[in-house]
């Protein structure tokens, strides 16, 4: 009864440093409380980018200072990461946890490779 999490393999961030992707999970149980975390994996180091807990049927809310926003619909979460720069290019993993009711389930996606290209500065106009 493992939980499968699907996410796109590759996403290209916009010129404004915004990347969006869908994280979809196949829930083995009827969860009412779900936690979604975006992790970044660089080499063998894994760091948390952002996290949000939501009640099924309610909106996904990240902390005010988070670089992530998102919406949820059933077993699908639409994630947006903003403020990205070229140095942030990397593998972004969607982690889903069914927190309540028991049993707890953990689901980890294979990761989305997000490519970020810094925009060329505008040439000075005379």
């Amino acid at each position: 009864k493992a939980m499968h999490v699907a996410q796109p393999a590759v996403v290209l961030a916009s010129s404004r440093g915004i990347a969006s992707f869908v994280c979809e999970y196949a829930s083995p149980g009827k969860a009412t409380e779900v936690r979604v975390t975006v992790l970044r994996q660089a080499d063998s180091q894994v760091t948390e980018v952002c996290a949000a807990t939501y009640m099924m049927g309610n909106e996904l809310t990240f902390l005010d200072d988070s670089i992530c926003t998102g919406t949820s619909s059933g077993n699908q979460v639409n994630l947006t990461i903003q403020g990205l720069r070229a140095m942030d290019t990397g593998l972004y993993i969607c982690k889903v946890e069914l927190m309540y009711p028991p049993p707890y389930y953990l689901g980890i996606g294979n990761g989305t490779q997000i490519y970020v290209i810094d925009p060329e500065p505008c040439p000075d106009s005379d």
Epitope: M3, E33, V46, E48, I108
Partner: antibody, heavy 118, light 108 residues
Amino acid sequence: QVQLVESGGGVVQPGRSLRLSCAASGFTFSSFGMHWVRQAPGKGLEWVAVIWYDGNNKYYADSVKGRFTISRDNSKNTLSLQMNSLRAEDTALYYCARGALLGAFDIWGQGTMVTVSS
Amino acid sequence: EIVLTQSPGTLSLSPGERATLSCRASQSVSSSYLAWYQQKPGQAPRLLIYGASSRATGIPDRFSGSGSGTDFTLTISRLEPEDFAVYYCQQYGSSPWTFGQGTKVEIK
């Protein structure tokens, strides 16, 4: 550096209570689920309890449900295990462990020994 | 509850030999959620492998993990003196978190 240090173990009579503590340092405590795992003398590892992030969600092994209570104080980076109605079979070395971001238990304390005996 | 059964109970080998440890689950476990730990006498367990095959930070490459479904394997390619210890597998994909009973790797 990342570290977990348990305390509070000791010898206690059956039916009595004991409170274990685990002091965490070197990482953002509130971002991790925290577990208690025990090991009876000469035996294997047994998961006991977990508490998640903000402390609202907790899970227990059937063997301790209703007797043990796990809690955390994110402002003090501490994890606790309140053990009531102790039995001889609760005698074990108790470890606190961090649930890594990808789920496995990546950081363990040195353990604190609990002996339940009359 | 997912029951993990490890075999053999004890493995008697000499330094330099290859060790193959088995972990069998009572029901399918996604490879993303299986770990291996090493425990030496008087010490806490140490994470070796997570996600069935990924080495934890600082773990030498003589340790490798493989498997899927219900059958998983920890291989130590060439045993070093410090590798003689007890090894546990664990599943962490769903509650309750469970460990195998352990395999002791001892010096022959």
